[in-house]
């Protein structure tokens, strides 16, 4: 059974991930972002189901495309270079979902824009955090 300390650690990691995703979304939605139109043409794949930490595999598999989209944006929209930002997110996601179990992500048929994609994973983080508190 998870201990209170491991639950707290998970909660903190989810909060960190949530803040990173919100920061990216805010940077993209910045009215000064000249690349927004092009960024919205990138297709992102959404999970059929995202209710458990293991489903973060679906987010992990989209972090490569996410980094490429962020490379389009002006770096001043973010505190970190896209490569460093995605690297940080990868570390958190890996710790949350674990590297031992190999979960195969199932994707929904419909693709999403980067904004829809980020909102979906922000909602996921908020939902899991609420169950831990």
């Amino acid at each position: 059974a998870p201990t209170s300390s491991s639950t707290k650690k998970t909660q903190l990691q989810l909060e960190h991930l949530l803040l990173d995703l919100q920061m990216i979304l805010n940077g993209i939605n910045n009215y000064k972002n000249p690349k927004l139109t092009r960024m919205l043409t990138f297709k992102f794949y959404m999970p059929k189901k995202a209710t458990e930490l293991k489903h973060l595999q679906c987010l992990e598999e989209e972090l490569g495309p996410l980094e490429e989209v962020l490379n389009l944006a002006q770096s001043k929209n973010f505190h970190l270079r896209p490569r460093d930002l995605i690297s940080n997110i990868r570390v958190i996601v890996l710790e949350l979902k674990g590297s031992e179990t190999t979960f195969m992500c199932e994707y929904a048929d419909e693709t999403a824009t980067i904004v829809e994609f980020l909102n979906r994973w922000i909602t996921f983080c908020q939902s899991i955090i609420s169950t831990l508190t």
Epitope: T41, K43, Q57, E68
Partner: antibody, heavy 123, light 107 residues
Framework: QVQLVQSGAEVKKPGATVKISCKVS????????MHWVRQAPGQGLEWIGR????????KYAENFKGRVTITADTSTDTAYMELSSLRSEDTAVYYC????????????????WGQGTLVTVSS | DIVLTQSPATLSLSPGERATLSCQAS??????LSWYQQKPGQAPRLLIY???SLASGIPARFSGSRSGTDFTLTISSLEPEDFAVYYC?????????FGQGTKLEIK
Amino acid sequence: QVQLVQSGAEVKKPGATVKISCKVSGDTITAYYMHWVRQAPGQGLEWIGRIDPDDDSTKYAENFKGRVTITADTSTDTAYMELSSLRSEDTAVYYCTTITFLYSRELRWFAYWGQGTLVTVSS
Amino acid sequence: DIVLTQSPATLSLSPGERATLSCQASQYISNYLSWYQQKPGQAPRLLIYSATSLASGIPARFSGSRSGTDFTLTISSLEPEDFAVYYCLQHYSTPYTFGQGTKLEIK
């Protein structure tokens, strides 16, 4: 169906520069990141670098930095790879290949390839 | 840089047999791995992407699997046209790197 057609074989002297082209047909080049990969005779595959033709941003493998320049001409849907200060070890088949994030997940990998261009460096 | 180690270097089998090709990554790369087939004088052809997904037009006898940083390409029953060189490629981070290849030859 997207097709990539590369320029013909080249023979160059050590120290010279070679420039290979890769023409995209069946779609616009700006939908793709254009990558270059090489293969020395009897050897494996080696990633050189890539360009985003929409904004000309490039990424190069460390081994090639300073010697390689990848460019693209959106008016002709053509990508170019220029390699300078050639040496005998650069003798290889050079391939262009694509990645895109605008379509299916499969096309995020090297799904389309040119036929290859043999570059021979010999004195 | 991420190193991909393929084994065996050469695999000698007969048509109808099962082929198992291995690719081991030097660090965690999630499912950012693909497999390519290359025949003499031809460009590589995408077989498997995202570790386990079959590329379009590729026969169902090809399959990919992953266990941690170990990846496997399996050909369930070899056809004469399957004898070629196979490469794995990681897309987890640049520089993208290939394995050194496994040559599948007729026994």
